[in-house]
C-alpha cells in the first residue's frame, strides 16, 4: 500500500476576516441556546480571534483506507477537510496527498438541470453511473419521477426532498474519479434505514479501494473504519484503531463504549 | 440506560386521525436525528418521516400532506400527528432516535428504537 494522506504537526488560524465573520455569526447566535439546555456551540472554535482552529494534528492514511473523523461541534472537523483542501492554509507543519480529490459537504447543494447532469457532471460512464445510482438508493426514486433521470431540478423542474437531495450530493461526490473522497457527515438528512444502506453499500464496498475521510458521530461507522481521529477543540485527542480505541484507559473507555 | 417508549395507537377508521407520541428517557445528553417507520405484516419496515434537530423534516411520499412530524427537545419526545388515515397504513409504528448518551464523550451516538406500537385503520 502506497500513503495517500499525511498531515504532520499541522497547526491552522482562520484569516481575521474569517475571524471577525465568524465572530460576528456567533454573536448573532449567542441567545439562541437549543431547546434541551444545552449551550449552542455554533462556531464555538472562532470563539477568541487568533485561537487556532487546528493545532498539531498528525495522521497518516494508506491507499483504499477509511478514516472517520469525529468530535463535538467545533471541534475542526469541517476545517480539517478544509485544509486537505486547499481552502486552509497551515501556519505549521505539512500536508501531503495525491491529487484529485472529491467533496461531499454537509448541506447538499442542486444545480439547475437534470437529475444525470447533477451527478456526473462532464464525463459519461454508464455502468459507474449505474452503480452509484445504486449504492446510493436512488434508483427508486429515479423510477418514480416522470423523465426518470432526465427530470429536470432546480428552476422550474421539480423539488427534492432533503433525503433526496443529500443522497444526489453523495452520488456526485462519489462518481467522481478523484484519489481521495471527503465526506463531511452526508447522512445529516437520511433516515437510518438508508443511511444504513448506503454507509455498506456505496462508503463500505463501492468504495471499498478508495481512501476516504468520513466525519461522522456515529458508533457504528467508527467501527467500520480502518483508523480513527477524534479531534477536541482543534486538538487530535485520540488517533488510531477501534481496537486501540477500547483498550484506552478504563474509565474512558467504558464512557466510550457505554 | 436509555429507552424509548411509542405511545398513541389504536384502532382506528378510515379517514380518522391519531397522534402518536415517542419519549425517550435515561442519561441522554443530547439527541439528533428522530424518526417514524412502520412495518406491515410480512413487508420490509420502512421511512415514514424524519425530523433533525433544528427541525428539518422528510417523508415517505406514501404519506406527504397527511402525517406531519413534529419534536419537543425540551421533553425529548417526537410526535406524529396522522390525518386522513388509509387501511394501507396499518403497521406497527416505530419511534427511532440517534442518541448521544450523558456518559458518551464528544458526543458520539448510537441509534435507539422503540418497541412499536399498532395502527389499525379498517374500512
Known amino acids: 500500500t502506497t500513503t495517500e494522506v499525511v498531515m504532520e504537526n499541522v497547526t491552522a488560524f482562520w484569516e481575521e476576516g474569517f475571524g471577525e465573520l465568524f465572530e460576528k455569526a456567533k454573536q448573532n447566535n449567542n441567545n439562541r441556546k437549543t431547546s434541551n439546555g444545552d449551550d449552542s456551540l455554533f462556531f464555538s472554535n472562532f470563539s477568541l480571534l487568533g485561537t487556532p482552529v487546528l493545532k498539531d494534528i498528525n495522521f497518516k492514511i494508506e491507499r483504499g483506507q477509511l478514516l472517520a473523523v469525529a468530535g463535538s461541534t467545533g471541534a475542526g472537523k469541517t476545517s480539517l477537510l478544509m485544509m486537505i483542501m486547499g481552502e486552509l492554509e497551515p501556519s505549521e507543519g505539512k500536508i501531503k496527498h495525491s491529487g484529485r480529490i472529491s467533496f461531499c459537504p454537509q448541506f447538499s447543494w442542486i444545480m439547475p438541470g437534470t437529475i444525470k447532469e447533477n451527478i456526473i457532471g462532464v464525463s459519461y460512464d454508464e455502468y459507474r453511473y449505474r452503480s452509484v445510482i445504486k449504492a446510493c438508493q436512488l434508483e427508486e426514486d429515479i423510477s418514480k419521477f416522470p423523465e426518470k433521470d432526465n427530470t429536470v431540478l432546480g428552476e422550474g423542474g421539480i423539488t427534492l426532498s432533503g433525503g433526496q437531495r443529500a443522497r444526489i450530493s453523495l452520488a456526485r461526490a462519489v462518481y467522481k474519479d478523484a484519489d481521495l473522497y471527503l465526506l463531511d457527515s452526508p447522512f445529516g438528512y437520511l433516515d437510518v434505514l438508508t443511511e444504513k444502506e448506503i454507509f455498506e453499500s456505496c462508503v463500505c464496498k463501492l468504495m471499498a479501494n478508495k481512501t476516504r475521510i468520513l466525519v461522522t458521530s456515529k458508533m457504528e461507522h467508527l467501527k467500520k473504519a480502518d483508523k480513527i481521529l477524534i479531534l477536541h477543540e482543534g486538538s487530535s485527542y485520540f488517533y488510531g484503531t477501534f481496537s486501540e480505541l477500547q483498550n484506552l484507559q478504563p474509565d474512558f473507555s467504558s464512557k466510550l463504549m457505554g | 440506560q436509555v429507552q424509548l417508549q411509542e405511545s398513541g395507537g389504536g384502532l382506528v377508521q378510515a379517514g380518522s386521525s391519531l397522534r402518536l407520541a415517542c419519549a425517550a428517557t435515561?442519561?441522554?445528553?443530547?439527541?439528533?436525528?428522530m424518526g417514524w417507520y412502520r412495518q406491515a405484516p410480512g413487508k420490509q419496515r420502512g421511512m415514514v418521516a424524519i425530523?433533525?434537530?433544528?427541525?428539518?423534516?422528510d417523508y415517505a411520499d406514501s404519506v406527504k400532506g397527511r402525517f406531519t412530524i413534529s419534536r419537543d427537545n425540551a421533553k425529548n419526545t417526537v410526535y406524529l400527528q396522522m390525518n386522513s388515515l388509509k387501511p394501507e397504513d396499518t403497521a406497527t409504528y416505530y419511534c427511532?432516535?440517534?442518541?448521544?448518551?450523558?456518559?458518551?464523550?464528544?458526543?458520539?451516538?448510537?441509534?435507539?428504537w422503540g418497541q412499536g406500537t399498532q395502527v389499525t385503520v379498517s374500512s
Open positions: 435515561g442519561s441522554i445528553r443530547s439527541i439528533n436525528n
Open positions: 427511532h432516535a440517534e442518541i448521544t448518551e450523558q456518559s458518551r464523550p464528544f458526543y458520539l451516538t448510537d441509534d435507539y
Open positions: 425530523i433533525t434537530r433544528v427541525g428539518n423534516t
